[in-house]
């Protein structure tokens, strides 16, 4: 059945989302499966339901068990199961495997560690980060929004990283911790200011009225995995999505890796049934990464 494992530590906040997600307007009823007893929605209770979320503020070991959520739309009722386990706090620094979230990998140029499940909570920056129970200090470590960035990652940065934050509910504060392993890949990658391979700047492309045409925006950003690399088209300085012309559609960017190891992205703009007014538009190919933005412009002309 449609179920999801969730876990937490006693005396910490735990918030669980119904594995059966629906639109925000749908009603969600929660039950404790063993007794079929309804979970209250009143916030004065230590355990209460709030739409798609089930909140343990704070959690107790006795809360462990299977919880049923039923999401009700006008025409469909869908059931999910949350398998919740609350563990006693560990006396030592060791974090057992059953409390670990998924492992993430990083490299010298890409070392983001996201704090697991944090999006479920009402928290305010900054996050506290620990490695093997030691608070992280020094300029190499940057707590940014919901993730940690490590500069100049080295192999000995591998280990278990714990994020700690405070969840606020109606003026009351609850502590939350989450731990995941970080491994380091030996990758000699680098990133450069974007280089647009196509189209050439101020290029003109000849097209036939009434025919279909494709424009390819192709840019390279360096070597190896890239932290941020986007390639997109704009029409007269506007996003394609803001330009309500169904004949003109942008394909999702396709990653490409050449034999020389360059990391490149291609994004195709498809124009169906080319019209006269399309010749008046300015088509901008935009390539963006952490170094900055490069723009090449192309126009269409009649064959």
């Amino acid at each position: 059945k449609f179920s999801k494992q969730s876990w937490g530590l006693e005396n910490e906040a735990l918030i669980v989302r119904c594995p059966r997600q629906g639109k925000s307007s749908y009603i969600v009823d929660w039950y404790y499966s063993q007794t079929n007893k309804s979970i209250p929605t009143q916030e004065r209770n230590r355990v209460f339901a709030s739409g798609q979320l089930l909140k343990f503020l704070p959690a107790e070991v006795a809360d462990s068990g299977i919880y049923t959520c039923i999401v009700r739309s006008p025409t469909f009722n869908r059931t999910g199961y949350a398998n919740v386990t609350i563990y006693k706090k560990q006396p030592d620094c060791n974090v057992p495997d059953y409390l670990m979230y998924s492992t993430v990998s990083g490299s010298e140029k890409n070392s983001k560690i996201y704090c697991p499940t944090i999006d479920l909570y009402n928290w305010t920056a900054p996050l506290e980060w620990f490695k093997n129970c030691q608070a992280l200090q020094g300029s190499r470590y940057k707590a940014h929004k919901s993730f940690l960035v490590i500069d100049n990652v080295m192999t000995d940065d591998a280990g278990d990283y714990t994020c700690k934050f405070i969840h606020n509910e109606n003026g009351a504060n609850y502590s939350v911790t989450a731990t995941r392993s970080f491994t380091v890949k030996d990758e000699q990658g680098f990133s450069l200011f974007p280089v647009i391979r196509a189209p050439a700047h101020n290029e003109t492309k000849e097209v036939e009225i009434g025919e279909n045409t494709n424009l390819t925006c192709s840019a390279c950003f360096g070597k190896g995995a890239q932290f941020l690399a986007t390639v997109q088209w704009q029409l007269n300085g506007n996003k394609i999505t803001d330009f309500s012309e169904p004949r003109i559609q942008q394909e999702e960017g396709q990653n490409q890796s050449f034999s020389n190891g360059l990391a490149c992205v291609n994004t195709v703009l498809r124009i169906a049934d080319v019209k006269e007014e399309d010749l008046l538009l300015r088509y901008d190919c935009l390539a963006l990464n952490l170094h900055g933005l490069r723009r090449h412009t192309i126009r269409l002309s009649r064959k």
Partner: antibody
Framework: EVQLLESGGGLVQPGGSLRLSCAAS????????MFWVRQAPGKGLEWVSS????????YYADSVKGRFTISRDNSKNTLYLQMNSLRAEDTAVYYC????????????????WGQGTLVTVSS | EIVLTQSPATLSLSPGERATLSCRAS??????LAWYQQKPGQAPRLLIY???NRATGIPARFSGSGSGTDFTLTISSLEPEDFAVYYC?????????FGQGTKVEIK
């Protein structure tokens, strides 16, 4: 009452283009994901493409990727399928259908279907 | 891509008999599986969602069961209007896929 009405089908030569439309009524079009599903003569159902309610995410079957483009105009309650570089194997009845549940990146069932429009690709 | 295999391809039965249709997935789809009925010249009609829940307006003689990879659609007592083609569909992930169909015909 939910209604979906496809149009735009017809006979087209291989390599040609066609644009299908699906006019929707009887529900809040802008919040539901919409699908195109096709059925070749005497064959089973094949998912072609889908688009989320706000048009922000589109999905395609491998067999049509790069040739077909799904889009929607929520102000007109209309779903589109632009079909380019058509092949004989694209010959089918094309149905538009509603996914009444799907949330971002997930799918559900198709509870309402149009009557279908026939696309024939032949020289 | 998850492949759904339906069996049998054709089921020849008389009105009043019980029909049992099978759908097997190439990997687990939890209970993210639906059944549709299609009559000649018509669009498919949703019967069952989430493996075992009847859609609005579907008669109680239709029932679904199963979870993971093996699913069954049962029609407890066939009515004349039930003779049609039945498809299963999974929606656990993209792309959604359909089975090849089972035709229930009059014996």
């Amino acid at each position: 009452e939910v209604q979906l009405l496809e149009s735009g089908g017809g006979l087209v030569q291989p390599g040609g283009s066609l644009r299908l439309s699906c006019a929707a009524s009887g529900f809040t079009f802008s919040v539901d994901s919409m699908f195109w599903v096709r059925q070749a003569p005497g064959k089973g159902l094949e998912w072609v493409s889908s688009i989320e309610g706000n048009g922000g995410a589109t999905y395609y079957a491998d067999s049509v990727k790069g040739r077909f483009t799904i889009s929607r105009d929520n102000s007109k309650n209309t779903l589109y399928l632009q079909m380019n570089s058509l092949r004989a194997e694209d010959t089918a009845v094309y149905y538009c259908a509603r996914d009444p549940w799907s949330t971002e990146g997930s799918f559900f069932v198709l509870d309402y279907w149009g009557q279908g429009t026939l696309v024939t690709v032949s020289s | 891509e998850i492949v759904l295999t339906q069996s049998p391809a054709t089921l020849s039965l008389s009105p009043g008999e019980r029909a049992t249709l099978s759908c097997r997935a190439s990997q687990s789809v939890d209970d993210d599986l639906a059944w549709y009925q299609q009559k000649p010249g018509q669009a498919p009609r949703l019967l069952i969602y989430d493996a075992s829940n009847r859609a609005t307006g579907i008669p109680a003689r239709f029932s679904g069961s199963g979870s993971g990879t093996d699913f069954t659609l049962t029609i407890s007592s066939l009515e004349p209007e039930d003779f049609a083609v039945y498809y299963c569909q999974q929606y656990i992930g993209a792309p959604i896929t359909f089975g090849q169909g089972t035709k229930v015909e009059i014996k």
